[in-house]
């Protein structure tokens, strides 16, 4: 689905947080300056992430404070890399039916997840909810991100005197026009409605449209409902 | 390590409020939720709620809708259940659970909460 | 919302025995499916994880199985302090808890 992509749409300006979504809560992934991968409740300054879309559906993941790659080992381990290898620093991105995306390793066939167990990636499979994603735009303020993303240190390497050669640091304009949340929502659960249960809206936070083409109406992704 | 510390055990009367503190240790208090958990004497598991620590922001199950108020103290680490308008059938242990994303890891030690007239 | 069923309700076994409690859901819930143990006066204690998964420190004589909606916990030697109940609970959507097993000593 290379098309409904967060990667290619132009509506996420450059940063963005991928975070796994249940009816009640979300974890944004975030990588931290010693390469330690996990979730955290909210967007923080790890948790914004530069995705950047190679060949084949193939993805490149990239904690822009922590300066650091996505990257997974051999036992489906993911963690933070300065140094980018192509084998355990690409991911391939798919988009579930229900909308959600995954990534998972070529090379070692593992889900990214921020659960702890390391389940491989059949086609056709329903991973659990933890292992699948969204995409929101960044709502830290730019201030915050003062410092340069990282570089490939490969012999391949780009140019040294770039520090921010995609400008990701700085906001760009939109080239279409995307809504600021969908107001689709999950059918409700029988015994814990959302509107009984939370009549203040708490958990049913908007989200950004970041995947042109998604799977609801005018286009929205799933409306995850969480606090 | 982590923990998470409940306070002690409570003897109320029907239509009384009742506030449960949990105080967390060994961990950073804002990256992970909060669930509280009760059960009645004899009884299973009952999902309560949940809370954002950051934002303070909660969910609860909607058998409680109205009655429990959850809250947090980032200054201590410390989440605060309130169940009001008490009647003989709240009788239970409370329990705070922290989320892992994939399951419960820790617990406190449980509240016991005794509605008597 | 998603129910969760255990069977047996409860058991007796002896100690050496290999023990299976099932717990189904009544929708797929994929691997997201956690057991617990609990002995009387005491917090739930996690074993498994993802369905399959053993929790650090958790004897190996504890096993998960299952996927969608139909799970096992398998405990294959009794041991004395295993007698207590079991739990299950999802977390695929909300966070719903199976009704127990209580296993004791025949």
């Known amino acids: 689905y290379p098309n409904a992509s967060p990667l290619l749409g132009s509506s996420w300006g450059g940063l963005i947080h991928l975070y796994t979504a249940t009816a009640r809560n979300s974890y944004h992934l975030q990588i931290h300056k010693n390469g330690h991968v996990d979730g955290a409740p909210h967007q923080t300054i790890y948790s914004a992430l530069m995705i950047r879309s190679e060949d084949a559906g193939f993805v490149v993941i990239t904690g822009v404070m922590s300066r650091r790659y996505l990257c997974m080992d051999f036992r489906g381990n993911i963690f933070g890399s300065h140094y980018f290898d192509p084998e355990n620093c690409r991911f391939q991105h798919q988009t579930l039916e229900n909308g959600y995306d995954v990534y998972h390793s070529p090379q070692y066939h593992f889900l990214v997840s921020l659960g702890r167990a390391k389940r491989a990636f059949l086609p056709g499979m329903n991973p659990p909810p933890y292992s699948q994603f969204l995409s929101r735009r960044n709502e830290i303020p730019l201030i915050h991100f003062n410092t340069p993303i990282p570089r490939r240190h490969t012999r391949s390497a780009e140019d040294d005197s770039e520090r921010d050669p995609l400008n990701v640091l700085k906001p760009r304009a939109r080239m279409t026009p995307a809504p600021a949340s969908c107001s689709q929502e999950l059918p409700s659960a029988e015994d814990n409605s959302p509107m009984a249960s939370d009549p203040l809206g708490v958990v049913r936070g908007g989200r950004v449209n970041t995947h042109a083409g998604g799977t609801g109406p005018e286009g929205c992704r799933p409306f995850a409902k969480f606090i | 390590q982590v923990q998470l510390v409940q306070s002690g055990a409570e003897v109320k009367k029907p239509g009384a409020s009742v506030k449960v503190s949990c105080k967390a240790s060994g961990y950073t208090f804002t990256n992970h939720y909060m669930h509280w958990v009760r059960q009645a004497p004899g009884q299973g598991l009952e999902w309560m709620g949940i809370?954002?620590?950051?934002?303070?922001?909660?969910s609860n199950a909607q058998k409680f809708q109205g009655r429990v108020t959850m809250t947090r103290d980032t200054s201590t680490s410390t989440v605060y259940m309130e169940l009001s308008s008490l009647r003989s059938e709240d009788t239970a242990v409370y329990y705070c659970?922290?989320?892992?994303?994939?399951?419960?890891?820790?617990w406190g030690q449980g509240t016991m909460v005794t509605v008597s007239s | 919302a998603i129910q969760l069923t255990q069977s047996p309700s409860s058991l007796s076994a002896s100690v050496g025995d290999r023990v299976t409690i099932t717990c189904r859901a009544s929708?797929?819930?994929?691997?997201?499916l956690v057991w617990y143990q609990q002995k009387p006066g005491k917090a739930p204690k996690l074993l498994i994880y993802d369905a399959s998964s053993l929790e650090s420190g958790v004897p190996s004589r504890f096993s998960g199985s299952g996927s969608g909606t139909d799970f096992t916990l398998t405990i294959s030697s009794l041991q004395p302090e295993d007698f207590a109940t079991y739990y299950c609970?999802?977390?695929?959507?909300?966070?719903?808890f199976g009704p127990g097993t209580k296993v004791d000593i025949k």
């Open positions: 929708q797929g819930i994929s691997s997201a």
């Open positions: 609970q999802q977390f695929n959507d909300y966070f719903t």
């Open positions: 659970a922290r989320d892992r994303v994939d399951a419960f890891d820790f």
């Open positions: 809370i954002n620590p950051i934002s303070g922001s909660t």
